[in-house]
Every structure is written in structure tokens, then in C-alpha cells.
């Protein structure tokens, strides 16, 4: 199988004329050392080819999980989930773009995009590296988390005396602690503006507004629809 034939991610599927958004199974790749993986592909947004790595929409799946679960992934690919840091690391080994889509409780949708996205390996605590921000989600609320290691309730890699993962109730690239908390606690309407550990993006709605819906998705930088 040549590299042109290989299916690595949703952009590979798109190039092979799979154009319907939904669940796909990526085959294992012995050369890359990647196992078979079920993914959700967004084949519509801004040309398609996006591999969804996180979704918050129903609030039924708790994201207050341990290191092992964030490494392997949890939740349902059809619902709320985290794809898994190991999978995200593999998917971002080529130059990759990140898109974050957010919806508030008033139904307004905003997005943030990053020209470059790398998730380092476990040895480097799945450290986040980001390129330039663009979008309409207000101030860049991931910049503060750039070049920051991933932390969970059982592995404190943040830059703070506080244990940010325990404080903000999630797994994330905590600094000291947050300008955003996309893996925070899902709060429903009525509770959504009362807490600091919710699903926040400070650059849009501030520190204590928990969003209704979030999706994080990636695709190769050189993707051409």
C-alpha cells in the first residue's frame, strides 16, 4: 500500500470520495503503529475532511476522567467523546490544522482555527503546540495553553501551585489555570453561568459561562477540498 493509497484520517477518506459526514473506521497501519480506529468525520465544514477529536453536546458523559482514559479515549463517537490523546498525537504528526466550534445557550455559533496544531507524545505529557489563531470566537483563549502539558485529576502537569485539573474538573492543557476549559463540566441551562469549572472560552463569554456545544476537529494543513 503506497502512502497515497493509505487511509490515515478523515481527509484521506474525503480524497477517496467519502463525502458524507458520520462514523468511519480507519484501518490499522502497521508502519505508523496505529490501531484500527473509529472516527467521526465532518465532510462538510469549510471543505470537509475534518477528524473530530472532541465533542460536547449532550452533557451525559462526564469529562472528569483520569490520565489513562484521556490517553485511550472515552465516550461515544456518536455522542460526547474524547478521541484519546494517543490517537490525537498520531493524527497530528503531519502538519495539522485545528478548528474549535462553539455554541452558546442563545444559539450563537462561533469558531476558532489554528494554522498549526501538534500534540506531542506521552513522554512529553501530550504537550500542546499551536500556530496562528483566526476566527470569530473573540480573543484567542487557547494561546494561554500553548506549549503546556496535559493534566488530569491523577496527573498534575500544570504550571500552578493549585491542581488545576481537580479545580477545573477536567483533563486539559492547564497552565495556571485557564483561559478556556473545553473539557470542563457540562452545565445545563440555568446552571450554565454560575460556575468556574464549566466548558469555558474566556475570549467569548468569560470565565463562568459554560457553553452548550463544542467540537474540536483537525485536518492536514495542506488539505485541498
Amino acid at each position: 500500500q503506497t502512502s497515497a493509497d493509505a487511509i490515515y484520517d478523515c481527509s484521506s477518506l474525503y480524497q477517496k470520495n467519502y463525502r458524507i459526514s458520520g462514523v468511519y473506521r480507519l484501518p490499522s497501519n502497521d508502519f505508523l503503529g496505529s490501531p484500527e480506529l473509529e472516527v467521526f468525520c465532518d465532510m462538510e465544514t469549510k471543505g470537509g475532511g475534518w477528524t473530530v477529536i472532541q465533542r460536547r453536546k449532550s452533557g451525559l458523559v462526564s469529562f472528569y476522567r483520569d490520565w489513562k482514559q484521556y490517553k485511550q479515549g472515552f465516550g461515544s463517537i456518536r455522542g460526547d467523546f474524547w478521541l484519546g490523546n494517543e490517537h490525537i498525537h498520531r493524527l497530528s504528526r503531519q502538519p495539522t490544522r485545528l478548528r474549535v466550534e462553539m455554541e452558546d445557550w442563545e444559539g450563537t455559533v462561533r469558531y476558532a482555527e489554528y494554522s498549526h496544531f501538534v500534540l506531542s507524545n506521552e513522554l512529553n505529557s501530550y504537550r500542546l503546540f499551536l500556530g496562528n489563531y483566526s476566527g470569530n470566537a473573540g480573543n484567542d483563549a487557547l494561546y494561554y495553553h500553548n506549549n503546556t502539558a496535559f493534566s488530569t485529576k491523577d496527573k498534575d502537569n500544570d504550571n500552578c501551585l493549585d491542581k488545576c485539573a481537580q479545580l477545573r474538573k477536567g483533563g486539559y492543557w492547564y497552565n495556571c489555570c485557564t483561559d478556556s476549559n473545553l473539557n470542563g463540566v457540562y452545565y445545563r441551562l440555568g446552571e450554565h453561568d454560575k460556575h468556574l469549572d464549566g466548558i469555558t472560552w474566556y475570549g467569548w463569554h468569560g470565565a463562568n459561562y459554560s457553553l452548550k456545544r463544542v467540537e474540536m476537529k483537525i485536518r492536514p494543513e495542506d488539505f485541498k477540498p
Partner: antibody, heavy 120, light 107 residues
Framework: QITLKESGPTLVKPTQTLTLTCTFS??????????VGWIRQPPGKALEWLAL???????QYSPSLKSRLTITKDTSKNQVVLTMTNMDPMDTATYYC????????????WGQGTLVTVSS | DIQMTQSPSSLSASVGDRVTITCRAS??????LNWYQQKPGKAPKLLIY???SLQSGVPSRFSGSGSGTDFILTISSLQPEDFATYYC?????????FGGGTKLEIK
């Protein structure tokens, strides 16, 4: 429809190892998000969660029992096995296995339960 | 670990009564709270998940409310088949934990 059934010994001696098998139908343990859990209930007492295994082989254990518990799955056989070492009379209980749906960590379908008595 | 405390531990009521059972978490768990019903010699049955979502097939006289640390299970009009033990369970963080149970008996 989803069904689960526990099987294993009804009587074990102290210090022995208990092996319980949960055989299920109506769902696949290779479906994203799905899990199977074990919960026990001593006679006349409350429910106690023991362990949970997910579709991706992630395993979660009760911290107080973690050193004694092992949970495994055989997706092709539709089975989940729980082993518990160094059994004690205090472990006498009805042991249930239950289906954890793909949309949350709770149990929407349960087996009938199997009563395990620990006695010499 | 998150402790779940139910009250009362037992309750006597009559058919047709409105009954409430409370469950309190030792820390905030948002809406990650589930309710089960168990009859003697039987396995538990899921009634409510995510604090207020009614499980398929469960009669509408059962309802759940609350968020954070305090939760309530309400049975609007008790039926003879509702006399059982009720348990709450948090699914916010492992270890998953259950309340001590509330036994609902006929007055």
C-alpha cells in the same frame, strides 16, 4: 433486546479466588462508548460498584478493592470475566453484571445476579 | 471518593401519596446523578439518569430534579408496585458510588 447473565460458583472458601463470568447478548462490546460493569450487594445492604470495562479495553476499579480485582473481556464470545482474589466472608454478596450504555456511566440493563457465599 | 447520602433511609406511605426521596453528594456532581429501583430478590432497575431524564419504559409518575449536590426523586402518586428500595448513584467520577438506599414501605 439486551440481556446479561452471571455465572460462577455459589460457594467459595476463604482465601480462594472467585471467578465470575457475565455472558451478554443484544449489544457488542466493540461499540464505541459501551461498557460492562460489576456491582455487588451484601445481604440486606446497599449496592457497591466494583469494576467497569469499556469497549476500548479501558478498565476502572473500585480503589478499595483494586488490588484484588481483575476485569477482562472476550468480545467474540460476548463475555466479561471478573476475578476477585483472597475471598473473605465479608465478600458474601449477590454479584451483578450490568450494561453501561454509550451515553453515560450508569447501568440500564442488569443481570439477575448470582449469590456468592464465602464460608469454610 | 464522592460520598452519596440518601434520606430518609426508610419511609412509610400510602397508595396515591406523593413521595420525595433526597440524595446529597459530598461534592458538586453537576447533573451526573442516576436513580434505581430495586424490589426484593430482583436486580435494580434504572429509573432516571442525568438527574432528570426518564429512562425508556418508566412511568411518568417518576421524576428527578436537582443539580450540584442536592437531588430529589419524586413519585407523584404512589402505586402498589412502587413499594421498593431506591438508590441514587453518581456518574461524575470514578469510583462510581451509590447511596445507602431508601426503603419505601406501605403505611
Amino acid at each position: 433486546q439486551i440481556t446479561l447473565k452471571e455465572s460462577g460458583p455459589t460457594l467459595v472458601k476463604p482465601t480462594q479466588t472467585l471467578t465470575l463470568t457475565c455472558t451478554f447478548s443484544g449489544f457488542s462490546l466493540s461499540t464505541s462508548g459501551v461498557g460492562v460493569g460489576w456491582i455487588r450487594q451484601p445481604p440486606g445492604k446497599a449496592l457497591e460498584w466494583l469494576a467497569l470495562i469499556y469497549w476500548n479495553d479501558d478498565k476502572q476499579y473500585s480503589p478499595s478493592l483494586k488490588s484484588r480485582l481483575t476485569i477482562t473481556k472476550d468480545t467474540s464470545k460476548n463475555q466479561v470475566v471478573l476475578t476477585m482474589t483472597n475471598m473473605d466472608p465479608m465478600d458474601t454478596a449477590t454479584y451483578y453484571c450490568a450494561h453501561n450504555p454509550d451515553y453515560g456511566d450508569f447501568f440500564d440493563y442488569w443481570g439477575q445476579g448470582t449469590l456468592v457465599t464465602v464460608s469454610s | 471518593d464522592i460520598q452519596m447520602t440518601q434520606s430518609p433511609s426508610s419511609l412509610s406511605a400510602s397508595v396515591g401519596d406523593r413521595v420525595t426521596i433526597t440524595c446529597r453528594a459530598s461534592q458538586s456532581i453537576s447533573s451526573y446523578l442516576n436513580w434505581y429501583q430495586q424490589k426484593p430478590g430482583k436486580a435494580p432497575k434504572l429509573l432516571i439518569y442525568a438527574a432528570s431524564s426518564l429512562q425508556s419504559g418508566v412511568p411518568s409518575r417518576f421524576s428527578g430534579s436537582g443539580s450540584g449536590t442536592d437531588f430529589i426523586l419524586t413519585i407523584s402518586s404512589l402505586q402498589p408496585e412502587d413499594f421498593a428500595t431506591y438508590y441514587c448513584q453518581q456518574s461524575f467520577s470514578t469510583p462510581l458510588t451509590f447511596g445507602g438506599g431508601t426503603k419505601l414501605e406501605i403505611k
